[in-house]
Interface confidence: medium
């Protein structure tokens, strides 16, 4: 017969003859013969194969590596690469999430309007008026101004959107 | 001048607890979030936890997670970090860092010199 120009999914052509692919999970060890199978083993401990292949060598999992603030998302398996995520308060550098950054911080007069998520960083918005911000946080929002009035109490010194008011007693003497 | 200066560490055995202690001046320390970080012998700075100036709001690895406790006194001028169920992979010199302002990857604008604890039988 003649040796076939194609092969079926799932097997490949060598020697003039269709050798059946190593499924995922599983590498290459002998290609198959006229008298046996395509030999295939499976991957090591941390190692995968996502695909029906006819490789020799399984990929290394990703390495979640907390020294870039990394940490496992999804564990990988024989089939699957391993997921890396952000920890918390930090989020991905690239969709690929290769390296995170620490959420940047509001400066004083500005308050977190979001707070960051694993993919995005912090959202900051001026403080309006009547409120303020006296911290450098990738956290805090902006505070309201104390209200003298409730504590009966006159403002001494205004606030602004770094400072809040002073409160002070109020004048007793009537002219 | 920004100084911190850790204090707490120590040697302990598995399961052992120790608080960690971290003292801040040359900068007005309630308005800044804080944060503990680690390098244990041979390896990089690993993050292990942040709190926010207010102290509202506090993060942690997934490896300290349900362990640690982050906390501030402000009025004190003090970070504390009390460590309970100790590992031998909690071994490490763990340094207090103030947060940077900007974008960093691992680069802690300040850090004290650190203190080192020790988690061995």
């Known amino acids: 017969p003649e040796p076939p120009t194609a092969c079926r999914e799932k097997q490949y052509l060598i020697n003039s003859q269709c050798c059946s692919l190593c499924q995922p999970g599983q590498k290459l060890v002998s290609d198959c013969t006229e008298f046996t199978e395509t030999e295939c083993l499976p991957c090591g401990e941390s190692e995968f194969l996502d695909t029906w292949n006819r490789e020799t060598h399984c990929h290394q999992h990703k390495y979640c590596d907390p020294n870039l603030g990394l940490r496992v998302q999804q564990k990988g398996t024989s089939e699957t690469d391993t997921i890396c995520t952000c920890e918390e308060g930090w989020h991905c550098t690239s969709e690929a999430c290769e390296s995170c950054v620490l959420h940047r911080s509001c400066s004083p007069g500005f308050g977190v309007k979001q707070i960051a998520t694993g993919v995005s960083d912090t959202i900051c918005e001026p403080c309006p008026v009547g409120f303020f911000s006296n911290v450098s946080s990738a956290f805090e929002k902006c505070h309201p101004w104390t209200s003298c009035e409730t504590k009966d109490l006159v403002v001494q010194q205004a606030g602004t959107n770094k400072t809040d008011v002073v409160c002070g007693p109020q004048d007793r003497l009537r002219a | 001048e920004v100084q911190l200066l850790e204090s707490g560490g120590g040697l302990v055995q598995p399961g052992g607890s120790l608080r960690l202690s971290c003292s801040a001046s040359g900068f007005t320390f309630s308005g800044y979030d804080m944060q503990w970080v680690r390098q244990a012998p041979g390896k990089g700075l690993e993050w292990v936890s942040t709190i926010s100036a207010s102290g509202v709001y506090t993060y942690y690895a997934d490896s300290v997670k349900g362990r640690f406790t982050i906390s501030r006194d402000n009025s004190k001028n003090t970070l504390y970090l009390q460590m309970n169920s100790l590992r031998a992979e909690d071994t490490a010199v763990y340094y207090c860092?103030?947060?940077?302002?900007?974008?960093?990857?691992?680069?802690?604008?300040?850090r004290g010199r650190g203190t080192l604890v020790t988690v061995s039988s």
């Open positions: 860092a103030k947060y940077p302002n900007r974008f960093a990857l691992n680069s802690f604008d300040y």
